[in-house]
């Protein structure tokens, strides 16, 4: 998260760290007791590694009573996700058992009504991704509030040049932005999950390259079918 600040500890009980061989790889969001939603591209290079999900965490390194690492029973990338595109960049991870819920671990309601979030709406994005242009990785969860950007502006030739489909949404990126390591994390508007940080190779913190988020409402049928 660029230009953000440290989050209030455990105030985002839905927040997950998707880990590869014990190290943070991507963000994720608990959407049901046994399911975490993340980004498909996160597992592209994870073929031989052990994927786990950390819940109830604020610090990645310090012991915390609410922290627990879960093995992954099943990883379900969206069937249409492809390595070279940002489209359909969603992944559902089934935990080895139902998460133990409490004040620091709780699923987040997700948007089912397939309607665009109004431009200008302030939404919260959180993650353990890099916090500056040096590439520093934080130990504690960071967050930032970002205004939603209208699709027409986001699709300008100078911005994302038509790449933003109706299944994607954008948020402003002028110095405040999601970045490397935040992929798969939640974009939360009005207490509801609206988007998932895509895991492309976009430059961070540049106002002409807005943040791109997968609209979960557009994938309600797929999410329901996997969770069923």
């Amino acid at each position: 998260i660029l230009g953000g600040r440290e989050a209030e500890a455990h105030a985002r009980p839905y927040m997950a760290s998707v880990q590869l061989n014990g190290a943070h790889l991507c963000g994720g969001v608990l959407v049901a007791e046994q399911w975490v939603l993340s980004a498909a591209h996160c597992l592209e290079d994870a073929a031989d590694g052990k994927v786990q999900v950390l819940l109830g965490a604020h610090s990645l390194s310090q012991p915390e009573p609410s922290k627990r690492l879960y093995d992954v029973l099943r990883a379900v990338p969206h069937p249409d996700s492809q390595p070279d595109t940002i489209d359909h960049d969603l992944l559902l991870l089934q935990l080895s058992e139902k998460a133990t819920l409490g004040p620091a671990v709780r699923p987040l309601p997700w948007q089912r009504v397939d309607r665009d979030v109004a431009p200008g709406t302030l939404c919260d994005v959180a993650g353990w991704g890099i916090v500056n242009h040096a590439g520093r990785r934080p130990d504690s969860l960071q967050h930032v509030l970002l205004p939603v950007l209208d699709r027409a502006t986001c699709n300008r030739r100078t911005h994302h040049d038509g790449a933003i489909t109706e299944r994607l949404m954008c948020a402003e990126s002028n110095r405040r932005d999601s970045c490397k390591g935040d992929s798969g994390g939640p974009l939360v508007c009005g207490g509801v999950l609206e988007g998932v940080v895509t895991s492309g190779s976009r430059v961070c913190g540049n106002r002409k390259k807005p943040g791109i988020y997968t609209r979960v409402a557009s994938y309600a049928a797929w999410i329901d079918s996997v969770l069923a």
Partner: antibody
Framework: EVQLQQSGAELVKPGASVKLSCTAS????????MHWVKERPEQGLEWIGR????????KYDPKFQGKATITADTSSNTAYLQLSSLTSEDTAVYYC??????WGQGTSVTVSS | QIILTQSPAIMSASPGEKVTMTCSAR?????MYWYQQKPGSSPRLLIY???NLASGVPVRFSGSGSGTSYSLTISRMEAEDAATYYC?????????FGGGTKLEIK
């Protein structure tokens, strides 16, 4: 333990090119950014540029655009700096750094005929 | 590009003395990094994001500042602190270093 091991000193002729390497251990270079920094005697430090090894994206100080090319090979966990059309102004020690947090020991490049 | 001016260029301090050096930016920046470099060695990160101590750095080092004015303070000078100190800004591309402050032991 995090370590960055840089290639050995180079003595090169004016007009030639040189490719320096920086091999990381104790972490995966694709997890963050790898930077290169130039140090000349009495001239201090200059940031050359950086690479995101996960996707090859690079950013350079405009002063080094065309002079420096940064690449990375995630399979060998190594970052590279290639310097072209060398002149005496390129005589310096070059450092690689992981997120500016951990630094290599430096590689001395001397340009002389 | 943002030019960083460090002052003084050279200074000396006695063991136990408090040392403060400054880094002035030509225009406003949002945070600063500080590095220590001893002759023949690689730079070492001391302070990141203006005031955060890097891993393993003694607590006698501290950083502060905002806007165009930043400083590095050593609460009690020790012989091993003799080195050149550089500031660097990560706010505005290209990311620039200051010219350095050489700190000598009296």
């Amino acid at each position: 333990e995090v370590q960055l091991q840089q290639s050995g000193a180079e003595l090169v002729k004016p007009g030639a090119s040189v490719k320096l390497s920086c091999t990381a251990s104790g972490f995966k270079i694709k997890d963050t950014y790898m930077h290169w920094v130039k140090e000349r005697p009495e001239q201090g430090l200059e940031w050359i540029g950086r690479i995101d090894p996960a996707n090859g994206n690079t950013k350079y100080d405009p002063k080094f655009q065309g002079k420096a090319t940064i690449t990375a090979d995630t399979s060998s966990n190594t970052a590279y700096l290639q310097l072209s059309s060398l002149t005496s102004e390129d005589t310096a020690v070059y450092y690689c750094a992981n997120a500016m947090d951990y630094w290599g020991q430096g590689t001395s490049v001397t340009v002389s005929s | 590009q943002i030019i960083l001016t460090q002052s003084p260029a050279i200074m000396s301090a006695s063991p136990g003395e408090k040392v403060t050096m400054t880094c002035s930016a030509r225009s406003s920046v949002s945070n600063m990094y500080w590095y220590q470099q001893k002759p023949g060695s690689s730079p070492r990160l001391l302070i990141y994001d203006t005031s955060n101590l890097a891993s393993g750095v003694p607590v006698r080092f501290s950083g502060s500042g905002s806007g165009t004015s930043y400083s590095l303070t050593i609460s009690r000078m020790e012989a091993e602190d003799a080195a050149t100190y550089y500031c660097q800004q990560w706010s505005s591309y290209p990311w620039t270093f200051g010219g350095g402050t050489k700190l000598e032991i009296k």
